[in-house]
């Protein structure tokens, strides 16, 4: 299953399959997730080790048993790959690292005014993988405001150095934020020239394209089909690059197919997994296990659940079957692709779905109608769980926020439905940033069921929580995916990085905002909060957040939206925007429904609604 916990001051011994430099443990974990054999990782921050060569070291590890002995190492961080973690699987990494220079091949230098502009340039350059930016206070004046675009053979820095007044980060192309745009076209009977960066076997050109998309240096590819004239080259997928970023030439060639990486696509990237099953095909590889199962789909599920399994073959040979069950061969290889693809066999083959974003239907659960005051504009995909609850009567307007917590579930505030309990009038927009982008053609979700907490009473602040079941499940993308819920009764975690988002008013007597706003707000203890609200009862089922001096807060139109906190690299839904005295007033924090206190209720309602569990807490 999905294991998200991190082990501090611990290092996994042995099992090494690869090593690289990464700026933090989260990026190391992402590299482990996308490495075909990595199950575990250990990361050494700069502070944890004196050996300059091992600083920022990220060590990717495999283990037949799925675990390795942990040794104590001060400052080290270890953890698990996020294979099998559904919507948490993403190659997108937005963080910017201050005081760090990520080294690589510098292929472009320009002057820019901010690190954000440098990151944008990297994202809009086809070859850029990461960048470094020298701030205005950099010690050498001639380098100030320099934006260095970089790449390396493996897509990660060749070294990372601590350097004052330098900021580094990665391209946001894996976040589907590139302005370059992509070529979706597949060119039949055409072979591209240029440099081969890798060679793998794939059953079709589309698997080849997906592998190219997620390979750090692949810009385009050529695939030789299973009817290619040279038998030894059939099903070969050649991953390619060039100096210019495009093929320098192409040759008409029967039974070849060529195309481009989709990494530069805007708004949508292919899932990093291959779900198709190939009849009459045998995938060769190292045998992991053989089991008897009923049907090829069960064989694929078995492979997906066995974390080391990369691909499988389900044999229908009479000698491999007994009664209704046949042999399911679970296999793996060094690069995650079959070592041999044979046609005309009595079997079907396919891949593990361990890297699919969608996973199953389960979700990681790991007084004034209260926009964000004192906030700033959000960017695409920054808060992919945020939804806009809109009402369509004569006109259509945004009324509340909400949080996507599952394919078919949204969590919001009960008071959003005061006087508007009819599900037909509501439209739920997900995967959006600007309200002005909504037109009559913009897809929206309709409500199947509104479940208001049984103890909620209109005009009272208690139990201000409601679940919305959508009529149809939503697919997950970089711009539309769920937020993890906290563990039941989560009181021990100290959250220091919390944000509130919404399209609500920017001042008390304001108006709905066009661009989704975000504001970083510290949590306030319930005791402190109670002092500020002596006329109201602040219960243990509420959580407060705000600055003593005011100036930053949620406001009208943000209700029902998320208060999220990042802990150990993972975002969790800590609160639901509920109420407050005015907006952003001094010593008047915002009051939020404490989600952890309602976990039993959420699980009960999402399970009873259709008879099966929809949520699971993070391990």
């Amino acid at each position: 299953g999905c294991l998200t916990q991190l082990y501090e001051n611990a290092f996994f011994r042995g099992g090494d399959v690869a090593s690289m430099y990464t700026p933090n443990a989260q990026y190391c974990q992402m590299r482990c997730t996308f490495h075909p054999r990595c199950l575990l990782f250990s990361f050494l921050p700069a502070s944890s080790i004196n050996d300059m060569e091992k600083r920022f070291g990220c060590f990717l590890k495999d283990s037949v048993t799925g675990t390795l002995p942990k040794v104590h190492r001060t400052g080290a961080v270890s953890g698990h790959s996020l294979k099998q973690c559904g919507h948490q699987i993403s190659a997108c990494h937005r963080d910017i690292y201050k005081g760090v220079d990520m080294r690589g091949v510098n292929f472009n230098v320009s002057k820019v005014s901010s690190v954000e502009e440098c990151q944008k340039r990297c994202t809009s350059n086809i070859r850029c993988q990461f960048f470094s930016y020298a701030t205005q206070t950099f010690h050498k004046a001639e380098y100030r405001n320099n934006c260095l675009l970089k790449y390396s053979p493996g897509g990660t820095p060749t070294a990372i150095k601590v350097l004052s007044n330098v900021e580094s980060g990665f391209s946001l192309k894996p976040c589907a934020l590139s302005e370059i745009g992509c070529h979706m076209n597949i060119f039949q009977h055409l072979a591209f020239s240029d440099v081969d960066v890798a060679r793998v076997l794939t059953p079709d050109a589309f698997v080849c394209r997906t592998i190219c998309t997620y390979h750090p240096n692949c810009l385009f590819f050529t695939f030789y089909t299973n009817v290619w004239k040279i038998e030894s080259q059939r099903n070969v997928c050649l991953l390619k690059t060039s100096e210019s970023g495009t093929p320098s030439s192409s040759t008409p060639q029967e039974n070849t197919i060529s195309g481009y990486s989709l990494l530069t696509c805007k708004r949508t990237l292919p899932e990093p997994c291959h779900s198709k099953i190939y009849p009459g095909v045998d995938f060769g590889g190292e045998e992991l296990n053989v089991t008897f199962v009923k049907g090829v789909n069960v064989c694929q599920e078995t492979c997906t659940k066995m974390i080391r399994c990369q691909f499988f073959t389900y044999s229908l040979l009479p000698e491999d079957c007994k009664e209704e069950k046949c042999k399911c061969f679970l296999r793996l290889s060094m690069d995650g692709s079959p070592t041999r693809i044979a046609y005309g066999t009595q079997g079907s083959s396919g891949y593990s779905l361990r890297l699919c974003n969608t996973g199953d239907n389960s979700v990681c659960t790991t007084k004034t109608s209260t926009r964000i005051v004192g906030g700033t504009n959000s960017s695409w995909g920054e808060w992919p769980w945020q939804v806009s609850l809109q009402v369509k009567l004569t006109a259509q307007r945004h009324l509340c926020g909400g949080s996507l917590i599952g394919h078919q579930w949204v969590l919001t505030a009960a008071h959003c439905f005061d006087g508007l309990p009819l599900q037909d009038v509501w439209r739920i927009y997900s995967g959006i940033l600007n309200l002005s982008d909504i037109t009559k053609d913009t897809p929206f979700s309709q409500i199947k069921e509104i479940i208001i907490h049984q103890n909620y009473k209109v005009s009272e602040g208690n139990h201000d929580i409601a679940l919305i079941k959508l009529q149809a499940p939503l697919n997950y993308t970089e711009f539309q995916k769920p937020i993890c819920l906290p563990s039941k009764g989560d009181t021990s975690t100290i959250y220091t990085n919390c944000w509130v988002t919404g399209w609500g008013f920017s001042k008390e007597k304001g108006e709905i905002q066009n661009i989704l706003q975000k504001v970083n707000i510290p949590l306030v203890t319930n005791e402190e909060c109670q002092k500020r609200y002596q006329d109201y009862k602040i219960t243990q089922r509420m959580v407060c957040a705000g600055y003593k001096e005011g100036g930053k807060d949620a406001c009208k139109g943000d209700s029902g939206g998320p208060l999220v906190c990042k802990h150990n690299g993972m975002w969790r839904l800590v609160g639901i925007t509920s109420w407050g005295e005015g907006c952003a007033r001094r010593e008047q924090p915002g009051v939020y429904t404490k989600v952890a206190e309602y976990m039993d209720w959420i699980l009960e309602k999402t399970q009873s609604s259709d008879g099966k569990a929809q949520m699971q807490s993070p391990a």
Epitope: T225, P270, K276, G280, L316, Y343
Partner: antibody, heavy 119, light 107 residues
């Protein structure tokens, strides 16, 4: 020219049998999976059966399982569909189609042969 | 089996119109969605495979998009020869399944 040509259709009584043939030309027949697809009068397309390039693997729609048999003779570049215990609901135009190696789409179709089941 | 739902079942349009046909799969089929054109008394003809790739020889006014469960076929500038029935088909899983078809008629 890449071509598929069906034959063997005709009128048959319920419970009767018929054998359809599909002659392939213009491509290396032995390297492609093949399919039979049918279309009842005025209706949509329905997949009937699949066979792998060597003939080692076959599959059938539930509606014909146990009654129809797909086979191929790669030396003759010919695909067959043996239809037994025919029913009124089997009445349709039967098409053979080549399965493209690149996508599993049906990229080449025959012109179709009509099977009429009537007493 | 994966169900394919096509809409509309028929539509009336004029030469030069932009026509859009949608197809929804009952479960995710990645990009393994194909579109066919069939004229009366003729065999179907492959137009688009893998959701968006134009089959050789098919005019560029035909385009396809989508992935997962929702797909679209667009004819950008309808020509007289385009009046026909269009079928979507998934090739993601055995058995391959077709939509019920969309008949594009003259307005």
């Amino acid at each position: 020219e890449v071509q598929l040509l069906e034959s063997g259709g005709g009128l048959v009584q319920p419970g009767g049998s018929l054998r359809l043939s599909c002659a392939a030309s213009g491509f290396t027949f032995s390297m492609y999976p093949m399919m039979w697809v049918r279309q009842a009068p005025g209706k949509g397309l329905e997949w009937v059966s699949y066979i792998s390039p060597s003939g080692g693997m076959t599959d059938y729609a539930d509606s014909v399982k146990g009654r129809f048999t797909i086979s191929r003779d790669n030396s003759k570049n010919t695909l067959y569909l043996q239809m037994n215990s025919l029913r009124a609901e089997d009445m349709a135009v039967y098409y053979c189609a080549r399965v493209a190696g690149s996508s599993d789409a049906f990229d080449i179709w025959g012109q179709g042969t009509m099977v009429t089941v009537s007493s | 089996d994966i169900q394919m739902t096509q809409s509309p079942s028929s539509l009336s349009a004029s030469v030069g119109d932009r026509v859009t046909i949608t197809c929804r799969a009952s479960q995710s089929i990645s990009i393994y969605l194909n579109w066919y054109q069939q004229k009366p008394e003729k065999a179907p003809k492959l137009l688009i495979f893998a959701a968006s790739t134009l089959q050789s020889g098919v005019p560029s006014r035909f385009s396809g998009s989508g992935s997962g469960t929702d797909f679209t076929l667009t004819i950008s500038n309808l020509q007289p020869e385009d009046f026909a029935t269009y079928y979507c088909q998934q090739s993601h899983s055995i058995p391959p399944t077709f939509g019920l078809g969309t008949k594009v008629e003259v307005k």
